[in-house]
């Protein structure tokens, strides 16, 4: 899975009147990573592990280019005609990918209230659009507002291209995101459903990569899919993940069932506790 | 590939105990259940029990729960079964077998003739 | 315990012939819990089909399975030479797990 850096911008306008706020976002490797806040932007690492890959005082610089993105994205919805009464957004996602053969991706999207209808490779240079005609004219004004000046257009994009991949190259120097492995911690809980049922629940929280299994198994098989309930794999915040799975059961026949874990090559089994507000909790 | 491979057959007297051996390979020995399955001559297949080898849990048939131990070596990857107070009518062939993803048995052992007799 | 009878015992049939075998549950299983297996002489068992209708990996398409609550089928549509055997079916559902005492299709 590449290393990726993923850059989130959004502006706003109100009536055709493009607001000043903008909103940025910024994740490593899908992880939160920063965030820049409308009014004043000040990018702020997401969790203590922002921080670590960031190290001290070096937001100086991240402030500066979301800054200058806002409001080279403010100035592009001011263009964008015909907007109609009420609030619209602007959204651009760039994105810049390392694979692990050291090749490269990078690419831009933008949505028009939370429609996409304009992408580019940054690398080929090439653009493509959906059909639909709205987004075909959206299209066709934003990519001739970005060419006016063409020059500025080839250096700018060369630009995003080379400084996306020049700061994801600067993050994974930290070695705070090379590759780390992280287990995680399994929780098993249960909790009363009906009346000879029992909702037992098995949690997986502080684990990366995002790569995980997470099942039930009855007698060391596994149960079909219609009779568990998964969660989302989702950032905790703490640059790790969290998920979950459930499923009910008849109360007696606990020992027959196991939360079955894999996680980056290792494996581990976690039983159903005997007791109604007992926790297992264990790493592998 | 994977594979369970089983010790050699074994003939006991009466009052005796006997026990199996079973060595899975190509698989992580703890990321699945041992069960223990047994074959009279001519006969059905009779389940003895299960044992997780992660966290060791045992589930046995009733039936085999006086008389029959699962026990797992985790250094040598090794599950073993150990039926005593033999009597004739154990006369058969021991199976071990893998839990799969969707069945109790998806792979099975060469199967352990014991023979009881005085 | 939930017992499985499997009829009948013994079927007689020639190769392309189609085999239909039976398993009825003395109580009702999901069909999640009901698996067929295969076994030859001298060889052990080996997994055909798993939860009712699924084949395992390698069993050829002639081998089908069908059923729900007390009453499961194994069918082969054609019988190849490899196919006599014993055929046991098998459930997951409720402790102690249980098999079929077997149903030997031989060649007639």
């Known amino acids: 899975e590449p290393h990726s850096l993923r850059y989130n911008l959004t502006v706003l306008s109100w009536d055709g009147s493009v607001q000043s706020g903008f909103l940025t976002e910024v994740h490593l490797d899908g992880q939160p990573f920063l965030r820049c806040d409308r009014q004043k932007c000040r990018a702020k690492p997401q969790g203590q592990w922002a921080e670590d890959v960031l190290g001290n005082k070096t937001w100086d610089r991240e402030t500066r280019d979301l800054t200058g993105n806002g409001k080279d994205l403010r100035m592009t919805l001011a263009h964008i005609k015909d907007q109609k009464e009420g609030l619209h957004s602007l959204q651009e996602i760039r994105v810049c990918e390392i694979h692990e053969d050291n090749s490269t991706r990078s690419s831009q999207h933008f949505y028009y209230d939370g429609e996409l209808f304009l992408s580019q490779n940054l690398e080929t240079k090439e653009w493509t659009m959906p059909q639909s005609s709205r987004a075909q004219t959206l299209a066709m004004n934003v990519r001739n507002f970005l060419k006016e000046d063409a020059m500025k257009t080839k250096t700018h994009y060369h630009a995003m291209h080379a400084d996306c991949l020049q700061e994801l190259r600067r993050y994974l120097k930290s070695g705070v995101v090379l590759r780390r492995t992280v287990p995680p911690m399994v929780n098993v809980t249960r909790s009363e459903a009906s009346e000879g049922n029992i909702t037992v629940t098995c949690r997986a929280s502080g684990f990366y990569p995002w790569n995980i299994t997470l099942s039930w198994r009855q007698d060391g098989v596994s149960l079909s899919h219609d009779t568990q309930q998964w969660g989302d794999v989702l950032p905790d915040g703490n640059g790790t993940y969290q998920t979950w799975v459930a499923t009910r059961i008849c109360q007696g026949e606990e020992q027959r069932f196991t939360c079955y874990m894999e996680h980056s090559g290792n494996h581990s089994t976690h039983p159903v506790p005997s007791g109604k507000v007992l926790v297992l909790q264990s790493h592998w | 590939e994977i594979q369970l491979v089983q010790s050699g057959a074994e003939v006991k007297k009466p009052g005796s105990s006997v026990k199996v051996s079973c060595k899975p390979s190509?698989?992580?020995?703890?990321?699945?259940?041992i069960y223990w399955v047994r074959q009279a001559p001519g006969q059905g297949l009779e389940w003895i029990g299960y044992?997780?080898?992660?966290?060791?849990?045992?589930i046995y048939n009733q039936q085999f729960k006086d008389r029959a131990t699962l026990t797992v070596d985790k250094s040598t990857s090794t599950a073993y079964m150990e039926l005593s107070s033999l009597r004739s009518e154990d006369t058969a062939v021991y199976y071990c077998?893998?839990?799969?993803?969707?069945?109790?048995?998806?792979?099975w052992g060469q199967g352990t003739l014991v023979t009881v007799s005085s | 315990e939930i017992v499985l009878t499997q009829s009948p015992a013994t079927l007689s049939l020639s190769p392309g012939e189609r085999a239909t075998l039976s398993c009825s549950a003395s109580?009702?299983?999901?069909?999640?819990?009901l698996h067929w297996y295969q076994q030859k002489p001298g060889q052990s068992p080996r997994l055909l089909i798993y939860?009712?209708?699924n084949l395992a990996s390698g069993v050829p398409a002639r081998f089908s399975g069908s059923g729900s609550g007390t009453d499961y089928t194994l069918t082969i549509s054609s019988l190849e030479p490899e196919d006599f055997a014993v055929y046991y079916c098998?459930?997951?559902?409720?402790?102690?797990?249980?098999f079929g005492q077997g149903t030997k299709v031989e060649i007639k």
């Open positions: 098998q459930q997951g559902g409720s402790l102690p797990l249980t």
């Open positions: 044992i997780d080898p992660y966290i060791g849990r045992i």
């Open positions: 077998s893998r839990s799969g993803e969707r069945s109790n048995f998806d792979y």
């Open positions: 109580s009702s299983i999901s069909s999640n819990y």
């Open positions: 190509g698989y992580a020995f703890t990321s699945n259940n």
């Open positions: 939860r009712t209708s």
